[in-house]
């Protein structure tokens, strides 16, 4: 009967999922730094939360090793495009690990949204969604990058976001 | 040894995931009401199911508090567009809660798909996918809205859908 | 006290998710066969892995019955389009089951990406993401198909991929 405490805890864990790492971070005015770094995110206000994951300078940080479904959406838009109709946007999720000096590409999309904007109507909107399962060791980080960052439209945290949960 | 029943149940739960709330709802002819309300969904036929979540007038309703990965895809398409290249489509997931009188935006995308129709062939297709983790209390509801609903193409439940599962 | 082994195993399972089926397969040079069959995938190298799911000729195969969140992303791109600017791309996830002779559509998207290529710059990029919850019995398979396959761009496994996990 020495299992008592663990037993109750296990039932509680199973029922509530309370210990399953999960996070949803939202876009904010400070997300776009223009510094060449990753996007930064809101972690507490509104819809944003961290449960069993940490946050550091734009990165979600694993506290527990395992497989995670990671995802990000970015809202793109503009009036015309910086490079004209040939503009390509790259939206990606990247891993930082102490075991390797450079960021590792995990999930990446390329889009050419500006072909939609013409001389008559140069306003356009587009969206990019990425999601997939990756393995993270304790302390490994995942960040979001968008090139060209100038085309990301932020508003209220619902249109551009970044999250993860253990599977 | 009073743990017996619960113990077996717990093993069964863990192994089968049978009690983890999940749902996948599919588009149907009745999905588009033209009334300004949310999209309606098929809950039983074909690929559609509800497990530990309820459905009411287009909404997935939480029976258990927690964090849920919610998602929706809508198939967009048309022959030309009502507002030409300026036509914008907004696809969103929204929360209804007794604690607040208005729907709360959770995950939203804006797209300008009509630039995909070329000079002669006015036919175009586009797709919008949303997914992210949100917290739901018991009784809170999530709905899908698309503006302009006229541009949603329904067929067989595989192209437009709405789902969730607890994480 | 006859529960000892199972008890420890259960705690271990709960804590590590080690027995929850999951997979992430990545695009490779051999993915596009041109044979009219499904896309083929890398299962071991780089980011690819299988945990509690099998792989066979492009298909993820369920070893355990239940509901799975299945997903795929394909990177599309080209210089112009094979059928001119009206080209439509269909990206889908399909189920193969011994109980039915034909593949069953699960999740499907249609896109007209070539409208993004203009007369000045005929290079275009687009991306298609699908994800949703479906039920799989033991031995049932899920495959990815893209029509027109010629428009899928492979590089390093980060832009086109296919995965699943039990929910």
């Amino acid at each position: 009967d020495g299992h008592g405490g663990s037993w109750e805890q296990l039932i509680q864990e199973r029922r509530s999922h309370q210990n399953n790492p999960a996070a949803h971070l939202t876009g904010a005015n400070s997300s776009l730094t223009g510094s060449g770094g990753p996007l930064l995110w809101e972690t507490q206000l509104g819809l944003a939360f961290l449960r069993g994951l940490d946050y550091h300078d734009g990165a979600l940080v694993a506290n527990k090793a395992g497989y995670y479904y990671i995802y990000s959406k970015v809202q793109l838009g503009g009036v015309g495009c910086p490079l004209g109709l040939a503009s390509t946007i790259t939206h990606g999720l990247y891993k930082r690990t102490p075991r390797y000096p450079e960021e590792l590409e995990l999930l990446v999309s390329q889009q050419s949204p500006c072909g939609r904007a013409t001389s008559n109507s140069r306003v356009w909107w587009d969206s990019s969604f990425l999601g997939g399962v990756v393995h993270l060791e304790v302390g490994e980080e995942v960040v979001v990058r968008v090139l060209d960052e100038r085309l990301v439209r932020l508003r209220d945290g619902t249109r551009s976001y970044f999250g993860a949960f253990m599977v | 040894d009073g743990h017996g029943g619960s113990w077996e149940q717990l093993i069964q739960e863990r192994r089968s995931h049978q009690n983890n709330p999940a749902a996948h709802l599919t588009g149907a002819n009745s999905s588009l009401t033209g009334s300004g309300g949310p999209l309606l969904w098929e809950t039983q036929l074909g690929l559609a199911f509800l497990r530990g979540l309820d459905y009411h007038d287009g909404a997935l309703v939480a029976n258990k508090a927690g964090y849920y990965y919610i998602y929706s895809k809508v198939q967009l398409g048309g022959v030309g567009c009502p507002l030409g290249l300026a036509s914008t489509i907004t696809h969103g997931l929204y929360k209804r809660t007794p604690r607040y009188p208005e729907e709360l935006e959770l995950l939203v995308s804006q797209q300008s798909p009509c630039g995909r129709a070329t000079s002669n062939s006015r036919v175009w297709w586009d797709s919008s996918f949303l997914g992210g983790v949100v917290h739901l209390e018991v009784g809170e509801e999530v709905v899908v809205r698309v503006l302009d609903e006229r541009l949603v193409r329904l067929r067989d439940g595989t192209r437009s859908y709405f789902g969730a599962f607890m994480v | 006290d006859g529960h000892g082994g199972s008890w420890e195993q259960l705690i271990q399972e709960r804590r590590s998710h080690q027995n929850n089926p999951a997979a992430h397969l990545t695009g490779a040079n051999s993915s596009l066969t041109g044979s009219g069959g499904p896309l083929l995938w890398e299962t071991q190298l780089g980011l690819a892995f299988l945990r509690g799911l099998d792989y066979h000729d492009g298909a993820l195969v369920a070893n355990k019955a239940g509901y799975y969140y299945i997903y795929s992303k394909v990177q599309l791109g080209g210089v112009g389009c094979p059928l001119g600017l009206a080209s439509t791309i269909t990206h889908g996830l399909y189920k193969r089951t011994p109980r039915y002779p034909e593949e069953l559509e699960l999740l499907v998207s249609q896109q007209s990406p070539c409208g993004r290529a203009t007369s000045n710059s005929r290079v275009w990029w687009d991306s298609s993401f699908l994800g949703g919850v479906v039920h799989l019995e033991v031995g049932e398979e899920v495959v990815v198909r893209v029509l027109d396959e010629r428009l899928v761009r492979l590089r390093d496994g980060t832009r086109s991929y296919f995965g699943a996990f039990m929910v």
């Epitope: - | 290249l85 300026a86 006015r122 | -």
Partner: antibody, heavy 119, light 111 residues
Framework: QVQLQQSGAEMASPGASVTLSCKAS????????MNWVKKRPGQGLEWIGR????????NYNQKFMGKATFSVDRSSSTVYMVLNSLTSEDPAVYYC????????????WGQGTTLTVSS | DIVMTQSPASLAVSLGQRATISCKAS??????????MNWYQQKPGQPPKLLIY???NLESGIPARFSGSGSGTDFTLNIHPVEEEDAATYYC?????????FGGGTKLEIK
């Protein structure tokens, strides 16, 4: 009620230009496409093109490129069509037709403007 | 351009009988289960009036004696029972591709 009021009959000389107007009322002007259609005596209907009042974007029938030019004045809910370099092929009745809610048909029409070209 | 061929060019139908007008497109005007085919009525000195949109949908305010059918390339307008006021020229029109094109018209005379 929806009404499209077109300008009165026009007479012009060969080589000249003429501006036809179509004033909309009874609905939200920017929410509907406006099309222009030509009807020559004893012949069928010909679609000239369309304008999207919300943006001013235009699409023309290749046959009328360089012949017709559309514009919009949102403040007065009016669309215009300029026909230039008039020839003997241009005399006709010109109609504006509003794009329907599902935008690929014309559900309301102006009464038409008769254009005569005479030297 | 998509060519719309209407037949017959003219027809005379007795009051109360059925008038059938055919329209053939040079290529399919279907998209995702919908047919982008419309029918208009035009009387002398008047603008055209929309009768049927998307091949078979009756425009608001149009009498139920008008009906449309067909898909792909072959379409039909039926009027039954024909009334005196139906004397007019009828046009089919496709809107799947630019330029929109009309059939040559069918002149209906009531006997």
């Amino acid at each position: 009620q929806v009404q499209l009021q077109q300008s009165g009959a026009e007479m012009a000389s060969p080589g000249a230009s003429v501006t036809l107007s179509c004033k909309a009322s009874g609905y939200t002007f920017i929410d509907h496409i406006m099309n222009w259609v030509k009807k020559r005596p004893g012949q069928g209907l010909e679609w000239i093109g369309r304008i999207y009042p919300v943006s001013g974007e235009t699409n023309y029938n290749q046959k009328f490129m360089g012949k017709a030019t559309f514009s919009v004045d949102r403040s007065s809910s009016t669309v215009y069509m300029v026909l230039n370099s008039l020839t003997s092929e241009d005399p006709a009745v010109y109609y504006c037709g509003r794009g329907s809610y599902y935008w690929n048909a014309m559900d309301y029409w102006g009464q038409g403007t008769t254009l005569t070209v005479s030297s | 351009d998509i060519v719309m061929t209407q037949s017959p060019a003219s027809l005379a139908v007795s009051l109360g009988q059925r008038a059938t007008i055919s329209c053939k497109a040079s290529q399919s005007v279907d998209f995702d289960g919908d047919s982008y085919m419309n029918w208009y009525q035009q009387k002398p000195g008047q603008p055209p009036k929309l009768l049927i949109y998307s091949a078979s949908n009756l425009e608001s305010g149009i009498p139920a004696r008008f009906s449309g059918s067909g898909s792909g390339t072959d379409f039909t307008l039926n009027i039954h029972p024909v009334e005196e006021e139906d004397a007019a020229t009828y046009y089919c029109q496709q809107s799947i591709e630019d330029p929109w094109t009309f059939g040559g018209g069918t002149k209906l005379e009531i006997k």
